[in-house]
Amino acid sequence: DIIMRPSCAPGWFYHKSNCYGYFRKLRNWSDAELECQSYGNGAHLASILSLKEASTIAEYISGYQRSQPIWIGLHDPQKRQQWQWIDGAMYLYRSWSGKSMGGNKHCAEMSSNNNFLTWSSNECNKRQHFLCKYRP
């Protein structure tokens, strides 16, 4: 049998059974999640579940810019440092930078400080670029 690789929406990129859309416009975390959901197909702010996935995403984004952080789907909804992926994925792989996670910072971003390979927490009302993900 010939197995066809699923296709992603125009402009979205494919990696290991998932499609990713990098939005170079500004949304707070909750508005970014709503915009991801608006594309259907079960799309959410992206979960990043392995170093390989993180590296692929980081390489892609670095082709566009290297200075602006990007929202991902990791948040702390209870504000108790109990982080979870908005798409329901298991929170096993972690790639936090060494920065303090205190204060009113309950949403996660890919940090530009380490070529988008590590995460930082930030205030959820900040307007930033964002990354969506769905399984086609």
């Epitope: 170079r24 416009k25 500004l26 566009y64 810019q65 200075s67």
Partner: antibody, heavy 124, light 109 residues
């Protein structure tokens, strides 16, 4: 009230040089990216050059068709944007507008205020 | 990349007109689209920013939208007035590249 006032345009021969200025007022000039956009007579708008705020590195960007000939710069102490134009060609003839970024965060993408423009004519 | 607009559109006062702006590559939703109005002899003014936001002072007859399926943005002007007669330009960006559409001349008959 935001104001952008361009100057420095005029008639120049092919191969010549001009320096355009854009004096800004009514906003915190040093915090915003700025750009030059041109419009040839009877034609559409065409992006020329942009510069980010000093806080975002003061990076400069130029369209391919002016790369190496035009240089954008800023003097935050004077609230002034510049465009140094060298090796001018007939096809550079246009009204040159300066434009302010709408956001101090996401530099050099979209514009909210424009000046009235200054006309550059390249002809022998 | 390129942004393609119709060269001209015309409509009667009081009616609704829509001007399209189609992106030829990537996904138009990934970057903001902005719309400018330019009346004859004047510099451009912003009528829509961030895809669908109106600056203060722009009437709510002006609206912007994005359609990923057609990879296009649209500017819709309802309740047309003679003062709306002008050239309209869309604009977007990617990386360090800023692009304008070719412009659409709106004639209010």
């Amino acid at each position: 009230e935001v104001q952008l006032v361009e100057s420095g345009g005029g008639l120049v021969q092919p191969g010549g040089s001009l320096r355009l200025s854009c004096e800004a007022s009514g906003f915190s000039f040093s915090s915003y990216g700025m750009s030059w956009v041109r419009q040839a007579p009877g034609k559409g708008l065409e992006w020329v050059s942009s510069i980010t705020s000093r806080g975002r590195g003061g990076s400069t960007y130029h369209a391919d068709y002016v790369e190496g000939r035009f240089t954008i710069s800023r003097d935050d102490a004077k609230n002034t944007l510049y465009l140094q134009m060298n090796s001018l060609r007939a096809e550079d003839t246009a009204v040159y507008y300066c434009a302010k970024d709408w956001s101090a965060y996401d530099s050099v993408h979209l514009f909210d205020y424009w000046g009235r423009g200054t006309l550059v004519t390249v002809s022998s | 990349f390129m942004l393609t607009q119709p060269h001209s559109v015309s409509e009667s006062p009081g009616k609704t007109v829509t001007i399209s702006c189609t992106r030829n590559t990537d996904n138009i939703a990934f970057n903001y689209v902005q719309w400018f109005q330019q009346r004859p002899g004047s510099s451009p003014t912003t009528v829509i920013y961030e895809d669908n936001q109106r600056p203060s002072g722009v009437p709510d007859r002006f609206s912007g939208s994005i359609d990923s399926s057609s990879n296009s943005a649209s500017l819709t002007i309802s309740g047309l007035k003679t003062e709306d007669e002008a050239d309209y330009y869309c604009q977007s960006y990617d990386g360090n590249n800023l692009v304008f559409g070719g412009g659409t001349k709106l004639t209010v008959l």
